[in-house]
């Protein structure tokens, strides 16, 4: 942006000029984008409460298991075994857990009368030993039960294992039992009270309302909203059978979900439940399978200290509170249709890339001659023509030229380097369509200047037989009219071209070249259209009228402004203009690049 | 699950020199620790050499200064260089392999033959003149 100058610049604004099309296809594509994004707009606003201001669900959890549970033991007693049958009840088969979570116990192990003294290690791979080389005084093995004495002692028959300080006996290294012992939790019930807050809306509700039938269970179908859920129905719900997870025990996830829209108008907020197995179910035997820990029930006997190790399966539930609670708020509609705005531009840039591709040279050149049904696209390059001011980077090496004999023009951006421009290719570029407006600006002499002695008043054509080449013309020179540059050795080659690029007549020649470029009369008219009160003394008068020839030849020659800031006047021309508006003393400076 | 086989074993006169070698299938070798055993007729097996998985080495009392045992992971391969034989050296040897992915096998156990839970079918050496 320009730097600040006055007042009044502060107080402007800038916007853009656009080009309109009536075209019957690109209006219709116009209106499709514009209605799909709509569409789609609208829809994403109410499907999902974009208009709301979401906030995360704060909660606390509280849960009570119920059921009796019968379980029948085989203990060993006196090399005897022997089976047993006990109840457990909700404190014998649940456990005090931190966070959300509640655990039930559904098989076990037990080591029972273990006290503090020397014994011989279970046998294992790592236990057993052949002498007391294998074994080793005060080490302690992670996977080991006691801190090794360094002895290998007998442990049963020839079974020799090393002696530990430990809880004596060992806790043997034996599988779970199957069935679980606990087999009947299954049929458990749990009640979960879900308390949630949503500060920042002032809201607060809670999973079960006051006119709950407590004594419902959970369905998914037909009791959505019971807050009891039975133990092998969550199981069943995550396809599980808890005949399988009971015996190696397991986590599962208890998930309650609060979608709440808490607009007034639209008012809703009820938890959804699902669940989820949150173990491994297919873990490898030696990266422990299921979910155990070990607890021990202390006593004395006899004064000695002793303790039944427990080694509990069971699986422990986990719940998971998540969710959010939406509400009106014009901040986030005005933002959600402030972000959505720019999808709108998607047509523009569609239907400019529709313009642009087949306004191509790509189409123009290999797909337009071929294909008769593309043939309407060609309108495209109208359109890109009006919709696109292409504009060449003004270097120091950029030049235009243009031939009578050719219908374009010719640009040179690249460095002489002691060619002639004559010889120079350049790039082909079409010559401006003639704006025959700026005509009107001339003054009437050119229009109905009287008929010259000899000359017929029809459009004078050049002469079709070329002009016979003087000693003087240069080798460059093609219409015999040109002369040497006055410029030094490393300047030369840019005034080294003439009108035409094959042999001919001079532009020179031309009635036109008199009336529009040398005619004192019309010039004089152009200098005072732009300065009307214009004074000049001889001298300085042939300096302007010699430049505003000079203007006039590149305008009439090359019609964009742009490409005439640029143009390169041919030699003929250029004497010609000067012999008509000499300079009274001193070289001439030839052409000089505007920027 | 690894499969052990043990090649090199034959006749060879007393104070000769053999190589032994034990060669491992699986990708999972570097994570063993292997030794070498031998049982003469009528006798109980014995321990000779072993190596852990990280390099420690270990030999039987009757072989030591004369027994070298080495490992090579790109191979799969357990060389057991054999020399100064004696005609008590005639025994079938056997390969072992013991686990040590979830702990390694402490230094003063690499002798225990309950370590090993992998063994080969063993290759003959007789040591005679």
């Known amino acids: 942006m320009p730097a600040c100058c006055s007042c009044s610049d502060v107080f402007q604004y800038e916007t853009n000029k656009v080009t309109r099309i009536q075209s019957m296809n690109y209006g219709t594509i116009k209106w499709f984008f514009h209605v799909i994004i709509f569409s789609y707009v609208c829809f994403a606003l109410v499907s999902d409460k974009l208009y709301q201001r979401k906030e995360p669900v704060i909660s606390s959890v509280h849960t009570k298991v119920k059921g009796i549970a019968e379980v029948k033991e085989e203990i060993v007693e006196n090399g005897v075994k022997k089976l047993v049958h006990s109840v457990f009840d909700t404190a014998d088969y649940t456990f005090p857990l931190q966070g959300n979570s509640f655990f039930v116990m559904t098989n076990f192990l037990k080591t029972e009368g273990q006290e503090q003294r020397l014994c011989p290690e279970y046998p294992t791979r790592r236990t057993l030993c052949s002498s007391d080389r294998g074994c080793k005084k005060g080490w302690m093995d992670p996977q080991s039960k006691g801190i090794q004495t360094g002895r290998c002692v007998v442990y049963e028959g020839n079974q020799k294992t090393c002696e530990v300080s430990a809880w004596c006996p060992i806790e043997a290294v034996e599988e779970a039992p199957r069935p679980a012992l606990l087999n009947s939790a299954e049929n458990f019930t749990v009640l979960i009270k879900n308390n949630i807050d949503f500060p920042g809306h002032n809201y607060t509700t809670r999973n079960i309302l006051p006119g709950l039938n407590i004594t419902c269970t959970f369905h998914k179908t037909q009791n959505p909203q019971c807050p009891i859920f039975r133990l092998g129905d969550i199981f069943r719900e995550t396809g599980d059978n808890f005949s399988d997870v009971a015996i190696q025990g397991g986590i599962m996830g208890i998930e309650i979900y609060w979608d709440c829209n808490l607009d007034r108008w639209f008012h809703h907020c009820r938890p959804k439940y699902s669940f989820r197995r949150l173990d491994d179910k297919t873990t490898n035997v030696s990266l422990y399978p299921g979910y155990n820990f070990r607890y021990a029930k202390y006593y004395k006997e006899n004064n000695v200290e002793k303790r039944t190790l427990i080694k509990v399966f069971g699986i422990r539930f986990d719940i998971l509170v998540f969710g959010t609670g939406g509400k009106f708020d014009i901040i986030q509609l005005v933002v959600y249709i402030g972000s959505t705005l720019s999808y709108f531009g998607l047509a523009a840039v569609f239907i400019d890339f529709l313009i642009d591709t087949y306004s191509s040279n790509c189409c123009r050149s290999h797909i337009y001659p071929w294909c008769k049904c593309c043939q309407p696209c060609v309108v495209n390059e109208y359109y890109y023509r009006k919709k696109c001011e292409s504009i060449v980077e003004p270097k120091p090496t950029l030049k235009y030229v243009s031939f009578v004999d050719e219908s374009h023009i010719r640009m040179v951006n690249q460095q002489l380097l002691g060619r002639s421009l004559q010889d120079v290719k350049g790039q082909e570029v079409p010559r401006p369509a003639m704006d025959f407006t700026d005509l009107s600006r001339l003054p009437l002499a050119l229009h109905d200047t009287p008929p010259i002695p000899g000359q017929p008043e029809e459009i004078q054509l050049l002469r079709k037989e070329a002009t016979p080449r003087s000693r003087d013309s240069p080798v460059w020179c093609q219409c015999g009219s040109c002369l040497p540059s006055q410029l030094p050795e490393s300047h030369r080659c840019l005034e080294e071209l003439c009108c035409r690029k094959k042999p001919g007549a001079c532009i020179t020649t031309s009635e036109l070249f008199r009336k529009l470029v040398l005619s004192r009369h019309v010039l004089q008219f152009l200098l005072l259209y732009q300065e009307p009160l214009l004074a000049l003394d001889v001298d300085s008068t042939n300096s302007r009228l010699r430049h505003c020839a000079y203007r006039c030849y590149a305008t009439w020659r090359f019609g964009s402004q742009d490409m005439a800031d640029f143009a390169i006047l041919p030699s003929c021309c250029r004497w010609r203009i000067r012999k008509e508006f000499p300079k009274s003393e001193g070289q001439y400076s030839g052409f000089k690049s505007p920027y | 699950e690894v499969q052990l086989v043990e090649s090199g074993g034959g006749l060879v006169q007393p104070g000769g020199s053999l190589r032994l070698s034990c060669a491992a299938s699986g990708r999972t070798f570097r994570h063993y620790a292997m030794g070498w055993f031998r049982q003469a007729p009528g006798k109980e097996r014995e321990f000779v050499a072993a190596i852990s998985s990280y390099g420690s080495t270990d030999y039987g009392d009757s072989v030591k200064g004369r027994f070298t045992i080495s490992r090579d992971d790109s191979k799969n391969t357990v060389p057991l260089q054999m020399n100064s034989l004696r005609p008590e050296d005639t025994a079938v040897y056997y390969c072992?392999?013991?686990?040590?992915?979830?702990?390694?096998?402490?230094?003063?156990?690499?002798?225990?033959?309950?370590?090993?839970?992998?063994w080969g079918q063993g290759t003959l050496v007789t040591v005679s003149s």
């Open positions: 072992a392999a013991a686990d040590e992915t979830l702990g390694a096998v402490p230094n003063f156990r690499l002798h225990e033959k309950y370590e090993y839970e992998y």
